[in-house]
């Protein structure tokens, strides 16, 4: 019996087609992805093959103005239109709190939404009961297939699930649910979830009875043969894990942003054992036409986005200096504003010992692309912020050793004075540079804001300590020459859309007046370029 698994993960609000790098589509003939194009390919496969499941491994939420405006209603509407068969909850599905998951998505989805390792307690237990499930048995042709869901247990640090959801260890939670499926005589079981490739492989190895793992969260690109675009494969598709009980378990993921449709064919014997598995992600490029009816629906929903982008979010009573003459040379108040917003967006009081789990932010000055003039009645719009942060990036959470941070700050000024983008803006960090010293030895003071404290204060950076830092995904991926971050990071979790973080902060504060306040200093006479 043959099953075709089509899968997406980490789509992050890319409802419209995008450029090759998943940013805004400029030249339509070169654009990729989007739900209209995805639907064309899915329908083509459904017509050609008998037993097809379309699965999503989480993080549909968050990433473009679509989510900012529609808050998840767009996800339910278009996933319903595409007839997804099941979805696992990702960490970003909790970005607008539990209510922001229940109302727009859980109540409106016409397909099951899954997670076995999220347990509700207190008053939420009865409210959310039945709205998501640990597993679902789906009828496929004359057979049944069990899908069991899982979600990153780091979600309380990455999003806003509140205090009434407990995120259990994935493997511990999955095993009894798989066992339950076995007692229901379900002998073909897919683990569908959002914990990253390392956990996907562990699930394949450790959870008895799981036949296939379909994952997300780590944006992992797997491919067999010559890859069709810029993504470099982390391994073959499917990635085969030998389980502890000796079975060959295929593990798949399909990069991110709806650029590819994962395509995996599995052959089962009559006892539900995997005989063979093969496939590859399908690049959704312009050779696949966009479905006209879905495209028309997208265009209809688009209208509200254009209106939103010109509405006032809040006001500034000071000039927001995002000029390259400032942000690439010294502390600029636009950099301070953005870093303050980044920290504010990551406030999670999950431990009584810590006022917050993260206090530090770094931001490459080259990523700040425009100032905002306060002499326009102080008005700040999404459109204004899109000029400041035009690259459609995310502000991510990483864990780094102090020694890596020290290298990053040395890199920040290693060729100071040439208006290069690597000069770092900061939050929760006080740095002093001495430019009279040789490159690689210019950081003379680096103090960081404590987290395990009731009154936050600045302490010297410790080289061997592990710190959490919020930074742009561009830096996490080694951009602007920050190779040491990419090479030495201990953990990397994708965060919220950059513009959304700043716009939410401005809306919350209503009136802003960021200052230049001595976060970055130069010792001796090296104050100016």
């Amino acid at each position: 019996w043959e099953l075709t698994i089509l899968h997406t993960n980490d789509v992050h609000s890319r409802l419209e087609q995008t450029s090759e790098d998943s940013s805004k589509c400029v030249n339509a003939s070169r654009c990729m992805g989007g739900v209209a194009r995805l639907f064309t390919k899915v329908q083509q496969i459904r017509r050609a093959e008998p037993n097809v499941l379309l699965l999503d491994a989480g993080d549909q939420y968050q990433g473009t103005i679509w989510f900012t405006v529609y808050k998840g209603a767009e996800v339910a509407h278009f996933m319903n239109a595409l007839r997804y068969d099941a979805m696992a909850l990702g960490n970003h599905e909790f970005d607008n709190g539990v209510e922001g998951l229940i109302e727009p998505l859980l109540k409106e989805a016409k397909f099951p939404i899954l997670s076995a390792n999220i347990k509700a307690k207190g008053p939420l237990a009865s409210q959310i009961s039945g709205l998501y499930l640990p597993y679902k048995v789906l009828p496929v042709g004359d057979e049944v297939v069990g899908i069991v869901g899982y979600t990153s247990k780091e979600t309380p640090f990455l999003s806003n699930p509140g205090t009434n959801l407990v995120f259990e260890d994935e493997i511990t939670a999955l095993q009894p649910e798989v066992d339950k499926l076995k007692t229901l005589n379900v002998n073909k079981i897919i683990a569908l979830g959002h914990s990253g490739f390392e956990m996907d492989k562990l699930i394949a190895q450790k959870v008895r009875g799981v036949d296939v793992v379909v994952g997300g969260h780590s944006n992992t690109f797997l491919y067999t043969g010559n890859p069709p675009s810029k993504e470099v494969p982390a391994g073959k598709y499917p990635f085969i894990v030998t389980s502890d009980d000796g079975r060959k378990v295929p593990v798949v993921q399909a990069y991110a942003f709806g650029k590819y449709l994962g395509y995996l064919k599995i052959e089962f014997d009559e006892r539900g054992n995997v005989i063979s598995s093969h496939g590859n992600p399908i690049l959704l490029n312009s050779s696949i036409p966009e479905d006209p009816s879905i495209k028309a629906d997208i265009n209809k929903w688009r209208i509200k986005l254009d209106n939103y982008s010109t509405q006032e979010l809040g006001k500034t009573i000071v000039y927001l200096d995002g000029s390259s003459q400032s942000c690439r040379f010294r502390e600029c108040n636009m950099g301070n504003l953005i870093c303050d917003a980044m920290i504010n967006n990551n406030l999670r009081h999950t431990d009584e010992m810590f006022w917050n789990h993260v206090s530090m932010c770094i931001l490459n000055g080259g990523g700040i692309r425009s100032p905002i003039d306060e002499r326009n009645n102080g008005t700040i719009t999404w459109e204004n912020l899109a000029a400041v942060l035009p690259f459609g990036g995310t502000f991510d959470l990483v864990q780094l050793k102090g020694s890596t941070l020290k290298k990053a700050f040395e890199h920040s000024v290693h060729r100071y004075g040439q208006s290069t983008g690597e000069f770092l803006q900061v939050g929760g960090i006080h740095v002093v540079y001495d430019l009279s010293r040789k490159p690689g030895d210019r950081v003379v003071k680096l103090d960081v804001l404590c987290t395990k404290c009731r009154v936050p204060s600045y302490d010297p950076l410790k080289m061997d300590e592990v710190y959490k830092v919020i930074l742009p995904n561009f830096l996490a991926n080694g951009g602007d020459g920050f190779q040491m971050i990419k090479d030495e990071l201990l953990r990397h979790d994708s965060g919220d859309q950059d513009i959304n973080v700043v716009s939410t902060y401005i809306s919350k504060m209503k009136v802003i007046y960021p200052a230049v306040e001595g976060r970055i200093k130069f010792s001796h006479h090296h104050h100016h370029h």
Epitope: A109, K110, K136, V137, L138, P139, V144
Partner: nanobody, 124 residues
Framework: DVQLQESGGGLVQPGGSLTLSCAAS????????IGWFRQVPGKEREGVSC????????NYADSVKGRLTISRDNAKNTVYLQINSLKPEDTAVYYC?????????????????WGQGTQVTVSS
């Protein structure tokens, strides 16, 4: 949580008719596919009819084809099963079951929510 309550069962003469109702609470019926099952003591639960979430597709077991009609009234959050030309072998406990999915099935494992059942006895 989804709760299902069957009603309309009872004692009926052979050749008679009956309409069973399944009322859902705690969830809008719109997105649920509903199945009717029956069980005779000592035997497995048997799927007799099903209606998908859109109401556009229905199916019936061969043993009851032509004698059953399944329908839904989403406004009333209720699904109905009309049984005509009742036979003694139709005597069973009738259960309605639901699951959030586009498609129907006659397989017990597929359904996530079950009612308590209503007894139908066909006897003269």
């Amino acid at each position: 949580d989804v709760q299902l309550q069957e009603s309309g069962g009872g004692l009926v003469q052979p050749g008679g008719s009956l309409t069973l109702s399944c009322a859902a609470s705690g969830f809008t019926l719109d997105y649920l596919s509903i199945g009717w099952f029956r069980q005779v003591p000592g035997k497995e639960r048997e799927g007799v009819s099903c209606i998908n979430s859109s109401g556009g597709s229905t199916n019936y077991a061969d043993s009851v084809k032509g004698r059953l009609t399944i329908s839904r009234d989403n406004a009333k959050n209720t699904v109905y099963l009309q049984i005509n030309s009742l036979k003694p072998e139709d005597t069973a406990v009738y259960y309605c079951a639901a699951h959030k999915y586009y498609y129907c099935s006659n397989k017990v494992a597929v359904f996530d929510y079950w009612g308590q059942g209503t007894q139908v006895t066909v006897s003269s």
